[in-house]
């Protein structure tokens, strides 16, 4: 084993090239200079190193940069990034969006790994906020990224970044997340006209309050049932039959198919049966005619 520590004659690597692929583990360790590797990291991606070989190359960089790799090396890690642990990545200071893109490209097609999650976390914290360019990049690689953030983390998203969000980016968001995103979207799109505004705001409406839904009902927006079903139940309940009819337009007929599901079911229970009958859809379960409706929340407020 002792003789294996020295690089065999004529095997010293002068550059990182394909001649290294059949070097044994110990030969790579002995014959590849870490500083040379650091300056030629971009070549590693083109050479099919095995797992074992990549481990050796990583070990060399770890020894050269015990405090964490410089960004000039990180940007060119290529497939060596797949070998990094979250602990390794926490030592990095990644500030360039180009570096982030390069590393996300390596992981493309895979689910978000702990390494990628740590990288993104380091990057966003370094920037102080989730700006539009970053959000653009992250949602391009991971459409569900936005919905993986906590409401607290989402609060750092500036309204201007909302322009980068596509409807599919919000598919897995829960109501708590939409509650944070909706006001930002409302602010971001406030200068758009009615129909354009609705197209943009539609996918955020799961966070909209009652008064905004009432306002939309006056604008002939023809909300589809899929969007309606994602609205907050507490925001839908106070809407009148006439307001829901205006809000949905021709899609109102779809209420019948959804009458057993929230929020439609709960909304029906709050409406007078007389009013529901005006829709002509056969919706049942409203408050029977002649019954007095007491709004207990109003009563409590008055007392």
């Amino acid at each position: 084993e002792v003789e294996k520590t020295a690089c065999p004659s004529g095997k010293k690597a002068r550059e990182i090239d394909e001649s290294l692929i059949f070097y044994k583990k110990w030969e790579l360790e002995a014959c590849v200079d870490a500083a040379l590797l650091a300056t030629q990291m971009d070549r590693v991606n083109a050479i099919p190193f095995t797992y074992e070989q990549l481990d050796v190359l990583k070990h060399k960089l770890d020894e050269l940069y015990p405090q964490g790799y410089p960004e000039s090396v990180i940007q060119h890690l290529g497939y060596l990034f797949l070998k990094m642990s979250p602990e390794d990545i926490r030592k990095w200071n990644v500030t360039s969006l180009e570096t982030l893109k390069a590393l996300l490209e390596v992981n493309k097609g895979h689910e978000m790994s702990p390494q990628v999650a740590t990288l993104i976390d380091r990057f966003v914290k370094g920037r102080g906020q989730l700006d539009k360019d970053t959000l653009d990049t992250l949602t391009a690689f991971y459409p569900g990224y936005l919905c993986s953030l906590s409401p607290e983390e989402l609060s750092s998203v500036p309204p201007s970044s909302i322009w980068a969000v596509r409807p599919q980016d919000l598919d897995t968001c829960d109501p708590r997340q939409l509650d944070v995103l909706y006001p930002k979207a409302r602010l971001a799109f406030q200068n758009m006209n009615g129909s354009e505004y609705f197209v943009k705001i539609q996918s955020f409406l799961g966070g909209a309050p009652t008064e905004d839904l009432k306002a939309l009902s006056q604008q002939n927006v023809s909300m589809d049932l899929a969007t309606f079903m994602k609205l907050r139940t507490d925001a839908v309940l106070p809407l009148t039959v006439a307001e829901v009819q205006k809000l949905l337009g021709p899609h109102v007929e779809g209420l019948k198919a959804e009458e057993r599901h929230r929020p439609v079911r709960d909304w029906i229970l709050r409406q007078r049966q007389d009013d529901l009958d005006t829709l002509g859809l056969g919706l049942q379960g409203g408050i029977p005619n002649g019954y007095l409706v007491l709004d207990l929340s109003m009563q409590e407020a008055l007392s």
């Epitope: 001649s19 099919p48 095995t50 797992y51 797949l82």
Partner: antibody
């Protein structure tokens, strides 16, 4: 679409020679390392030879070393295997395959040709 | 590195859960791929990095394991799954394949 098509197989006497070709299409051939893998009738797979994208780095299994020569012509998107001093035990289906490293970061074979049969018999 | 697959063949029915194992002669981390080969056809990549499913491969196929012991599982065997399955290590050169497992109709 991405495709590899082998040709050149056939019946040859022991000690004879054969040259296999593999035509690549649908991808940037010059970016990828390529391999020849063989499968004897009713047997498993054996990695025979490997060539780097530029053609300057080559690997041979011990069983074929000194008898087989792998080469490539990137201008023609073609891979070759020159087989000399053939033996009965070289009888197999020969596949050309693309190394997946460039796409995945791992050294396995993501695209295979349909194979060409080589029979060595007197 | 030698790869030993077991069993070398098995008989199963449509709908069965099938498990094939591949054992490496030394630790290979997660550097393992699985291929499917039907008679007269080339092998087709199913799984790489021990558990990553190749795009277009049905989700009934899954891989697991790390170090020396690996498993390919078919959760509910379909008629088109009757074939021979091979493992391949890419931890170190030379790249090697397992001997194969033939899945036949019972």
């Amino acid at each position: 679409q991405v495709q590899l098509v082998e040709s050149g197989g056939g019946l040859v006497k022991p000690g004879g020679s054969l040259r296999l070709s593999c035509a690549a299409s649908g991808f940037t051939f010059s970016d990828y390392y390529m391999s020849w893998i063989r499968q004897a009738p009713g047997k498993g797979l054996e990695w025979v030879s490997y060539i780097s994208s530029s053609g300057s780095t080559i690997y041979y299994a011990d069983s074929v070393k000194g008898r087989f020569t792998i080469s490539r012509d990137n201008a023609k998107n073609s891979l070759y295997l020159q087989m000399n001093s053939l033996r009965a035990e070289d009888t197999a289906v020969y596949y050309c395959a693309r190394d997946g490293y460039r796409k995945y970061g791992y050294v396995f074979f993501d695209i295979w040709g349909q194979g060409t049969m080589v029979t060595v018999s007197s | 590195i030698q790869l030993t697959q077991s069993p070398s063949s098995l008989s199963a029915s449509v709908g069965d859960r099938v498990t094939i194992t591949c054992r490496a002669s030394q630790g290979i981390s997660s550097a393992l791929a699985w291929y499917q080969q039907k008679p007269g056809k080339a092998p087709k990549l199913l799984i790489y990095d021990a558990s990553s499913l190749e795009s277009g491969v049905p989700s009934r196929f899954s891989g697991s394991g790390s170090g020396t012991d690996f498993t390919l599982t078919i959760s509910s065997l379909q008629p088109e799954d009757f074939a021979t399955y091979y493992c391949q290590q890419f931890n170190s050169y030379p790249l090697t394949f397992g001997g194969g497992t033939k899945v036949e109709i019972k």
